[in-house]
C-alpha cells in the first residue's frame, strides 16, 4: 500500500511550498563524516554474516547494503555450528528517496526501507506444540 | 544522478508492510551481547526519536549467564539517512542527513586482547 | 572537538594510593565503555581498565591485581581509577579514553587523546 504518514505541521514564516509537497535538499549533511576502519565483526561474531548489495538507480542513494545471516544456528568455541543457538537479524530502518517516472513528468517519494545491519546470536523461544 | 533539490510528496511510503517490529523487540535480552536501548529525541530531525543501542556487557554471556571475557561484545553500527529541518523549525524544508546508529550488538572473537 | 581532561597525578610512595579523575566534554559521555590506559617510560601504551556504560561490568589487566576499582559519574561526564597498594612498576602517564568497540577497540583507532596525568611511584 502507499499509505504513508505525515509528520508536518502547516507552513508559518518559511519558505512557500506548493501544497502536499515539501522541498529536500538531498546534499547529504555529514556525508564525509568519520567511520571506523574496517572491524570484520561479520566474520568474527558468532553469528557471522554476508553483505548483498542493492542497485537501483531510481533510488537515492542507489546503492543499499544488506546483510544476511550466514547460519540458522551460531558459532560455538570450535568453530562448529551450535543449533541449540539462533542466528537472527538486526534490522533498522532508513529513509531513501524514489524517483517515479509517469510518462513525461518525474515524481520523488519518500519511502522507508528496513535494512537489515548485522546478526546476533540469541537463546531460543521454545515452541511447545499442543 | 539526482537534482540538488526535488519536491517530495508529503506522504512517506512504507516498504515495510510484510515485517513485524514486535518479531525483534526482545532480540536485546535473548542475545548472548545483550544491550540496552537508549532514546535519542531531536524536534527538528525526522524521524524524531531514534533508539540507540548500548552493549550492556563488555564480554558474553556464557551457557551459564555468566559474562566471558574470551568473548567481545561489540555495537553493530548503521548509518542511516534522516531528515534535518532547514531552515530550523520549518515544517516542510528538509535537508537528508546521515547519521551512524548503534542498531545492537553482536558477540565476537576477540583481536585485541587487552588482558594477557 | 572533543577534549579529555586527566588529573590527579604525582608522586607517591610504594603501597600509597592516587585517585585520578578524566573529564570528557565535546560528545555524549554515556559511550559503550571507558577505559584507563598507561604508557610506561620508554615502553608502549597499554590497557588498564574498562567499565561498560552502566558502570555494572568492569574489566582490568591481569598486572592490576585487584589493585585499581574504575568508576564512572555520568553526571559529571567523569571516570576515576582508584590505585591503591601501588608499585614503581606502575609509574607511567595514565590516559583516559572512551572505547567505542568495547574491549575489541583497537590503540589504533583511537584519533585523539587527551594530555594524560603523570604518576610516579618512588620511595
Known amino acids: 500500500g502507499s499509505e504513508g504518514e505525515t509528520f508536518f505541521q502547516k507552513p508559518e514564516s518559511c519558505p512557500p511550498v506548493p501544497g502536499g509537497s515539501m522541498k529536500l535538499d538531498i546534499g547529504i549533511i555529514n556525508e564525509n563524516q568519520r567511520v571506523s576502519m574496517s572491524r570484520n565483526i561479520e566474520s568474527r561474531s558468532t553469528s557471522p554474516w554476508d553483505y548483498t548489495v542493492t542497485w537501483d538507480p531510481n533510488r537515492y542513494p542507489s546503492e543499499v547494503v544488506q546483510a544476511q545471516c550466514r547460519n540458522l544456528g551460531c558459532i560455538n568455541a570450535q568453530g562448529k555450528e551450535d543449533i541449540s543457538m539462533n542466528s537472527v537479524p538486526i534490522q533498522q530502518e532508513t529513509l531513501v528517496v524514489r524517483r517515479k517516472h509517469q510518462g513525461s513528468s518525474v515524481s520523488f517519494q519518500l519511502e522507508k526501507v528496513l535494512v537489515t545491519v548485522g546478526c546476533t546470536c540469541v537463546t531460543p523461544v521454545i515452541h511447545h506444540v499442543q | 544522478n539526482f537534482p540538488r533539490t526535488v519536491m517530495v510528496n508529503l506522504n512517506i511510503h512504507n516498504r515495510n508492510t510484510n515485517t513485524n517490529p514486535k518479531r525483534s523487540s526482545d532480540y536485546y535480552d535473548r542475545s548472548t551481547s545483550p544491550w540496552n536501548l537508549h532514546r535519542n529525541e531531536d524536534p527538528e530531525r525526522y524521524p524524531s526519536v531514534i533508539w540507540e543501542a548500548k552493549c550492556r556487557h563488555l564480554g558474553c554471556i556464557n551457557a551459564d549467564g555468566n559474562v566471558d571475557y574470551h568473548m567481545n561484545s561489540v555495537p553493530i553500527q548503521q548509518e542511516i539517512l534522516v531528515l534535518r529541518r532547514e531552515p530550523p523549525h520549518c515544517p516542510n524544508s528538509f535537508r537528508l542527513e546521515k547519521i551512524l546508529v548503534s542498531v545492537g550488538c553482536t558477540c565476537v572473537t576477540p583481536i585485541v586482547h587487552h588482558v594477557a | 572537538q572533543v577534549q579529555l581532561v586527566e588529573s590527579g597525578g604525582g608522586l607517591v610512595q610504594p603501597g600509597g594510593s592516587l585517585r585520578l579523575s578524566c573529564a570528557v566534554s565535546?560528545?555524549?559521555?554515556?559511550?559503550?565503555?571507558m577505559g584507563w590506559f598507561r604508557r610506561p617510560p620508554g615502553k608502549e601504551r597499554e590497557f588498564v581498565a574498562a567499565?561498560?556504560?552502566?558502570?555494572?561490568?568492569?574489566k582490568y589487566a591481569d598486572f592490576v591485581t585487584d589493585r585499581f576499582t574504575i568508576s564512572r559519574d555520568d553526571a559529571k561526564s567523569t571516570v576515576y581509577l582508584q590505585m591503591n597498594s601501588l608499585k614503581p612498576e606502575d609509574t607511567a602517564v595514565y590516559y583516559c579514553?572512551?572505547?567505542?568497540?568495547?574491549?575489541?577497540?583497537?590503540?589504533?583507532?583511537?584519533?585523539?587523546w587527551g594530555q594524560g596525568t603523570q604518576v610516579t611511584v618512588s620511595s
Open positions: 567499565i561498560s556504560w552502566s558502570g555494572g561490568d568492569t
Open positions: 565535546g560528545r555524549t559521555f554515556s559511550s559503550y565503555a
Open positions: 579514553n572512551d572505547m567505542p568497540y568495547g574491549l575489541d577497540t583497537r590503540m589504533d583507532e583511537y584519533e585523539y
